[in-house]
C-alpha cells in the first residue's frame, strides 16, 4: 500500500504535489508499512477494540485562515474515554476516584507503555530497533524522553504527508508560501503503540484556507450603544473602530500597516497607521463603511528576465516551486520542478485586506446628568430607611426606562437594582426616588434607556444617620 491509499479517499495527482510543495513533507506515493501499521477501513469491527474502555476522539484545529507565505499551525488533541488521562510518563492511567461504566478500576493503568518498553526492548542500548519507525520506515527521532511518546500522528494534505511522534497533544506548523490559494483539506491518522507494532485509534479531517487577502475583523464600540453587535449606532457620539488582523504566526510583524477608511458619509478618505480610529456620524441613516488594510509583506519575487534563447532545447519545467525561505533547500534535481530562483531572495509584496459593513445611525440618549439630590423626609415608622430624590436631565432622544443600581462604595457589590418605565417630556427632566436602607456611603449607577441606547451616570452619596433633631439632610 501507498500512503495515499491509507490516508485519503482519492489518490492525489503529481500535479497537486508539484504545485504545493511543503518543506519537510514527503510524497504520498511512498510505501506504507502495513505490517507495523495495520490499515482498517471505516466500519471495520476492529475499531471497536482499538482502545480499552471506549473510543478515542481526535480533535483537529488550525489557526486558519492563513495569509499566503505565513505559517499555519495545526493542533491535534486526543480525548480519551471517561476517567482516562495521560500521566507524566506518557502512560494512560485511570483518574483517581472517577467512576465509569465499569466502576472503579483496581489496575491504575489503561496502558503501561513504560513497563512494556523496559521489558521488551532488547536493543543493546542503542534505542533503535526495527519497530521504532514511522509508517514509511524512517526511524523515530530520539529526543530526550522520546520513549514517553506513545502516539504516532500522520498528517496528510496536498498529496504529501508528515509523521510525528507525540503525546496526547501535538502541533505541526506548515509554511504556506507554495500552497494554492483557497480551501484545502488536512487529514490526520493517529496510531498508538501496541507491543512491537501499532494500532490505529483515530482519524480526523479539517478544512483550512490559504488566502492572499489579509484576514481582517473590525470591532466597533460606542458609549451608550445598547447592543454593540447589531451595527446600529447613535448620532453625535464617537464610534471607536478597532481593527484586528488575524496573523497568528506574526508574518506581518515587521510590516508597516496602513488603514484606509471610508465611512460612507461624504467625509472623504481617512488614512492612518493606527489600528484604532474614532468617527462621529452627524446624520441619521444607513452608511456603508469600507476599510482597506495594506501591508508590505514578504512575497514572491518577480521572475528574472528570460535568459538569452538557447540554441538547443533546455530541460522542461525549470520553475520555482520550493519555499523561497526554505532553510535547507535540497538539490534542484530532487524535484521534477527545478529551482530556478535564488532561495534567499527577500522580496516584498503589497497585501490587502478588506472589511465592509453597513451601519445604521439613529437618535439616542447622548448624556445623562444628576443635577440635584434631595433627602425626602420620612414618616416616623421607618427610622432606618432614607428616601432620596434624584433630579436627572438628559440629552438626545427621550428615554423610556430608568434603572438605578445601588452598590457598596467600591461600586462592585450590587445591593439593589430597580428599573421602571418613565414618561418624560421633551425637556428631558425627571425625578427618580429611591430608598436606602440605613446610613452610610453608597454607589449609585443611574441609567436611562430606550430601544437603541443606554446612558449611564454614577455618583457616590452619603446617607446620614437619622437624627430626630435634624430630620432632613441634604446629600452631598
Amino acid at each position: 500500500k501507498r500512503f495515499h491509499d491509507v490516508l485519503g479517499n482519492e489518490r492525489p495527482s503529481a500535479y497537486m504535489r508539484e504545485h504545493n510543495q511543503l518543506n519537510g513533507w514527503s510524497s504520498d506515493e511512498n510505501d506504507w508499512n502495513e505490517k507495523l501499521y495495520p490499515v482498517w477501513k471505516r466500519g471495520d469491527m476492529r475499531w471497536k477494540n482499538s482502545w480499552k474502555g471506549g473510543r478515542v476522539q481526535a480533535v483537529l484545529t488550525s489557526d486558519s485562515p492563513a495569509l499566503v507565505g505565513s505559517n499555519i499551525t495545526f493542533a491535534v488533541n486526543l480525548i480519551f474515554p471517561r476517567c482516562q488521562k495521560e500521566d507524566a510518563n506518557g502512560n494512560i492511567v485511570y483518574e483517581k476516584n472517577c467512576r465509569n461504566e465499569a466502576g472503579l478500576s483496581a489496575d491504575p493503568y489503561v496502558y503501561n507503555w513504560t513497563a512494556w518498553s523496559e521489558d521488551s526492548d532488547g536493543e543493546n542500548g542503542t534505542g533503535q530497533s526495527h519497530h521504532n519507525v514511522f509508517p514509511d520506515g524512517k526511524p523515530f527521532p530520539h529526543h530526550p524522553g522520546w520513549r514517553r511518546w506513545n502516539f504516532i500522528y500522520v498528517f496528510h494534505t496536498l498529496g504529501q504527508y508528515f509523521q510525528k511522534l507525540g503525546r496526547c497533544s501535538v502541533r505541526v506548523s506548515v509554511n504556506t508560501a507554495n500552497v494554492t490559494l483557497g480551501p484545502q483539506l488536512m487529514e490526520v491518522t493517529v496510531y498508538r503503540r501496541h507491543g512491537r507494532a501499532y494500532v490505529p485509534i483515530a482519524q480526523v479531517k479539517d478544512v483550512y484556507v490559504v488566502t492572499d487577502q489579509i484576514p481582517v475583523f473590525v470591532t466597533m464600540f460606542q458609549k451608550n450603544d445598547r447592543n454593540s453587535s447589531d451595527e446600529t449606532f447613535l448620532k453625535d457620539l464617537p464610534i471607536m473602530f478597532d481593527v484586528l488582523i488575524h496573523d497568528p504566526s506574526h508574518f506581518l510583524n515587521y510590516s508597516t500597516i496602513n488603514y484606509k477608511w471610508s465611512f460612507g458619509d461624504n467625509t472623504g478618505l481617512f488614512v492612518s497607521t493606527n489600528h484604532t480610529v474614532n468617527h462621529t456620524y452627524v446624520l441619521n441613516g444607513t452608511f456603508s463603511l469600507n476599510l482597506t488594510v495594506k501591508a508590505a509583506a514578504p512575497g514572491p519575487c518577480p521572475p528574472p528576465p528570460p535568459p538569452p534563447r538557447p540554441s538547443k532545447p533546455t530541460p522542461s519545467l525549470a520553475t520555482t516551486l520550493k519555499s523561497y525561505d526554505s532553510n535547507t533547500p535540497g538539490p534542484a534535481g530532487d524535484n521534477p520542478l527545478e529551482l530556478s530562483r535564488i532561495p534567499d531572495e527577500n522580496c516584498q509584496i503589497n497585501r490587502y485586506g478588506h472589511f465592509q459593513a453597513t451601519i445604521t445611525i439613529v437618535e439616542g440618549i447622548l448624556e445623562v446628568n444628576i443635577i440635584q439630590m434631595t433627602d425626602v423626609l420620612m414618616p416616623v415608622p421607618w427610622p432606618e430607611s432614607s428616601l432620596i430624590d434624584f433630579v436627572v436631565t438628559c440629552q438626545g432622544s427621550i428615554p423610556t426606562e430608568v434603572c438605578t443600581i445601588i452598590s457598596d462604595p467600591t461600586c462592585e457589590i450590587t445591593q439593589n437594582t430597580v428599573c421602571s418605565p418613565v414618561d418624560v417630556d421633551e425637556m428631558c427632566l425627571l425625578t427618580v426616588r429611591r430608598t436606602f436602607n440605613g446610613s452610610g456611603t453608597y454607589c449609585v449607577n443611574l441609567t436611562l434607556g430606550d430601544d437603541t441606547s443606554l446612558a449611564l451616570t454614577s455618583t457616590l452619596i452619603s446617607v446620614p444617620d437619622r437624627d430626630p433633631a435634624s430630620p432632613l439632610r441634604m446629600a452631598n
Epitope: 482519492e10 489518490r11 492525489p12 495527482s13 503529481a14 500535479y15 497537486m16 508539484e18 504545485h19 504545493n20 499566503v68 496536498l158 494554492t180 490559494l181 483557497g182 484545502q184 492572499d212 512575497g299 514572491p300 518577480p302 521572475p303 522542461s316 519545467l317 520553475t319 520555482t320 516551486l321 521534477p336 520542478l337
Partner: antibody, heavy 119, light 107 residues
Framework: QVQLVQSGAEVKKPGASVKVSCKAS????????MHWVRQAPGQGLEWMGE????????NYAQKFQGRVTMTVDKSTSTVYMELSSLRSEDTAVYYC????????????WGQGTLVTVSS | DIVMTQSPDSLAVSLGERATINCKTS??????LAWYQQKPGQPPKLLIY???KRYTGVPDRFSGSGSGTDFTLTISSLQAEDVAVYYC?????????FGGGTKVEIK
C-alpha cells in the same frame, strides 16, 4: 461569471513572434493557474504550458521550451503567451484555459485565437 | 511524458443508442483523467473530471469510468447535439497530455 476573452486573429511571417492575450474576469485572478493549449487545423489538443498569476511561476512543455514566454499583468488581470521563431507548423488556434484549484482540468476556456504563419 | 491513446478514431451510433469511447494511458494516472467535448469552431467543453465526476450542468447520459490506465466515456443514449469530437486528458502530471480525439457521428 468567469470569462476569458482572448485577443484577435494574427497573421505572421516565419521567424516572427506573436503575443496572444487572455483577459480574465469574474473570479480572483491570482488564485488560479492559467494554461495555454493549442490546436492545429483538423488536429488534436496540445498543452503548451502554464503560469501562476500570483507569483508568475511558469511551467512549459519541453517542446516549446526556449520559444514560449508566458507573462501576467495583474493590474488588468491579463495573461500573455508569446511564441517566437514562428514556423508554418505553429499555425493553430491558441486557447487559454483556467485550472481549478489543485486540479489541472479546464472548466473555463477562452474563445481561441487563430494564429496563421505564412510567408 | 504520459502518452494517451484514444480509440476508436471515429464512431457512428444510431440516435438513442449507447456510444463508448476508450482512453488508455502509458502509466497509472488514476483517478486524474478528464473528458471534453468539442464542436467545430468552439473551445472544448468539460464533461467529466477525476475519471468519473460529472461537471456541473452536464447531462447524466454522460458518464466516466475506469482506473489505473484504462478509462471509458459512455454516452448512454446518443442525442443529435452530441455529435462532436471527444478528447481525454490526464491531469495527473505535467506535461498535461490529451488523447488524439474520437469523432462521434450519427449512423
Amino acid at each position: 461569471q468567469v470569462q476569458l476573452v482572448q485577443s484577435g486573429a494574427e497573421v505572421k511571417k516565419p521567424g516572427a513572434s506573436v503575443k496572444v492575450s487572455c483577459k480574465a474576469s469574474g473570479y480572483t485572478f491570482t488564485s488560479y493557474w492559467m494554461h495555454w493549449v493549442r490546436q492545429a487545423p483538423g488536429q488534436g489538443l496540445e498543452w503548451m504550458g502554464e503560469i501562476n498569476p500570483y507569483d508568475q511561476r511558469t511551467n512549459y512543455a519541453q517542446k516549446f521550451q526556449g520559444r514560449v514566454t508566458m507573462t501576467v499583468d495583474k493590474s488588468t488581470s491579463t495573461v500573455y503567451m508569446e511564441l517566437s521563431s514562428l514556423r508554418s507548423e505553429d499555425t493553430a488556434v491558441y486557447y487559454c484555459a483556467r485550472s481549478t484549484g489543485n486540479y489541472a482540468w479546464f472548466a473555463y476556456w477562452g474563445q481561441g485565437t487563430l494564429v496563421t504563419v505564412s510567408s | 511524458d504520459i502518452v494517451m491513446t484514444q480509440s476508436p478514431d471515429s464512431l457512428a451510433v444510431s440516435l438513442g443508442e449507447r456510444a463508448t469511447i476508450n482512453c488508455k494511458t502509458s502509466q497509472d494516472v488514476s483517478p486524474s483523467l478528464a473528458w471534453y467535448q468539442q464542436k467545430p469552431g468552439q473551445p472544448p467543453k468539460l464533461l467529466i473530471y477525476s475519471a468519473s465526476k460529472r461537471y456541473t450542468g452536464v447531462p447524466d447520459r454522460f458518464s466516466g469510468s475506469g482506473s489505473g490506465t484504462d478509462f471509458t466515456l459512455t454516452i448512454s443514449s446518443l442525442q443529435a447535439e452530441d455529435v462532436a469530437v471527444y478528447y481525454c486528458q490526464q491531469h495527473y502530471s505535467i506535461p498535461l497530455t490529451f488523447g488524439g480525439g474520437t469523432k462521434v457521428e450519427i449512423k
